[in-house]
């Protein structure tokens, strides 16, 4: 019999390398049964996790799983760090493993793009 507890499927020690200036979507896979839980994102700052209330979030529903998405429009250098999603379900707080974003900049990327490329939008150039 399948559990009807809420589950958050972020893999332990998962990480993403992303470029400053790119749009990015950080997904928290959420499994639930009847009522969709209230999910939030926070960013780790030492031992505390600071709730991200000023960022755009959205839900993407798929057949067997849903995704609570944190949007970066665009990524800035200070978005570097570790993030966690958490769900409130029947008065219980369920926390995911943390996922780490490594933000790199064009100036520190291994191949330095041309001046024209730098002026072009990165989501066309760095797919």
């Amino acid at each position: 019999k399948e559990s009807c507890d809420v589950q958050l499927y972020i893999k332990r020690q998962s990480e993403h390398s992303i470029l400053a200036g790119d749009p990015f979507e950080l997904e928290c896979p959420v499994k639930y049964c009847a009522n969709r839980p209230h999910v939030t994102w926070c960013k780790l700052n030492g031992t505390t996790c600071v709730k991200l209330e000023d960022r755009q979030t959205s839900w993407k529903e798929e057949k067997n799983i849903s995704f609570f998405i944190l949007h970066f429009e665009p990524v800035l250098p200070n978005d570097n760090g570790s993030y966690r999603c958490s769900a409130n379900f029947q008065s219980n707080l369920i926390e995911s493993h943390s996922t780490t974003l490594y933000v790199t900049d064009v100036k520190s990327a291994s191949e330095r793009p041309s001046k024209d490329e730098m002026a072009s939008r990165p989501w066309l150039l760095y797919r």
Partner: antibody
């Protein structure tokens, strides 16, 4: 030549709403972020928010969340900023600017739209 | 929020003089600082991005320098057309923030 053409000045009563437009030309509209900036009293600049014309994704300054609404119309290469329930504090010049260099530097600016809220 | 503090608030210079404008960030912003020139009754124009990169078409008398928290815009030999407000801004962290500006006046 890249151009951002903003709508004309607005004189409105307190409590009214406005929608300022910014028509882009001379580049591919969906390739660059559009940014909105407020300038009060001809001096300091305040970032309102960004919109990605590709998908409509936004990031707002918390101060303007619920105050400004950023949208785009890809078919006409136009960005919009809606401001509801206006007060005298909203009187300012509003600029749209293109986020042309990563991560987010503003390389082209509209001419500005002057909003005056007065009874 | 990162506070960008510009100094001085205004300065009066003669044509040909060297001008140094300061911008200090309340916390480390690496080199994610830009400088904008705003002439009277005009919209801002990008001069410098990434603390030290001169934007296309900007005269080479304008030079940006600095990193972390202290940034400088230098005009090596000020011209009459440089009469303007100069704004610094950071794009290291949300919310993006600007300094209050420095007004450059000519004697």
């Amino acid at each position: 030549e890249v151009q951002l053409q903003q709508s004309g000045p607005e004189l409105v009563q307190p409590g009214a709403s406005v929608k300022i437009s910014c028509k882009a030309s001379g580049y591919t509209f969906t390739d660059y972020y559009m940014i909105w900036v407020k300038q009060s009293h001809g001096k300091s600049l305040e970032w309102i928010g960004n919109i990605n014309p590709n998908n409509g994704g936004t990031t707002y300054n918390q101060k303007f969340k619920g105050k400004a609404t950023l949208t785009v119309d890809k078919s006409s290469s136009t960005a919009y900023m809606g401001l509801p329930s206006l007060t005298s504090e909203d009187s300012a010049v509003y600029y749209c600017a293109r986020g042309g260099l990563r991560p987010l530097y503003f390389d082209y600016w509209g001419q500005g739209t002057t909003l005056t809220v007065s009874s | 929020n990162i506070v960008m503090t510009q100094s001085p608030k205004s300065m009066s210079m003669s044509v040909g003089e060297r001008v140094t404008l300061s911008c200090k960030a309340s916390e480390n912003v690496d080199t994610y600082v830009s400088w904008y020139q705003q002439k009277p009754e005009q919209s801002p124009k990008l001069l410098i991005y990434g603390a030290s990169n001169r934007y296309t078409g900007v005269p080479d008398r304008f030079t940006g320098s600095g990193s972390a928290t202290d940034f400088t815009l230098t005009i090596s030999s000020v011209q009459a057309e440089d009469l303007a407000d100069y704004h610094c801004g950071q794009s290291y962290s949300y919310p993006l923030t600007f300094g209050a500006g420095t007004k450059l006046e000519l004697i």
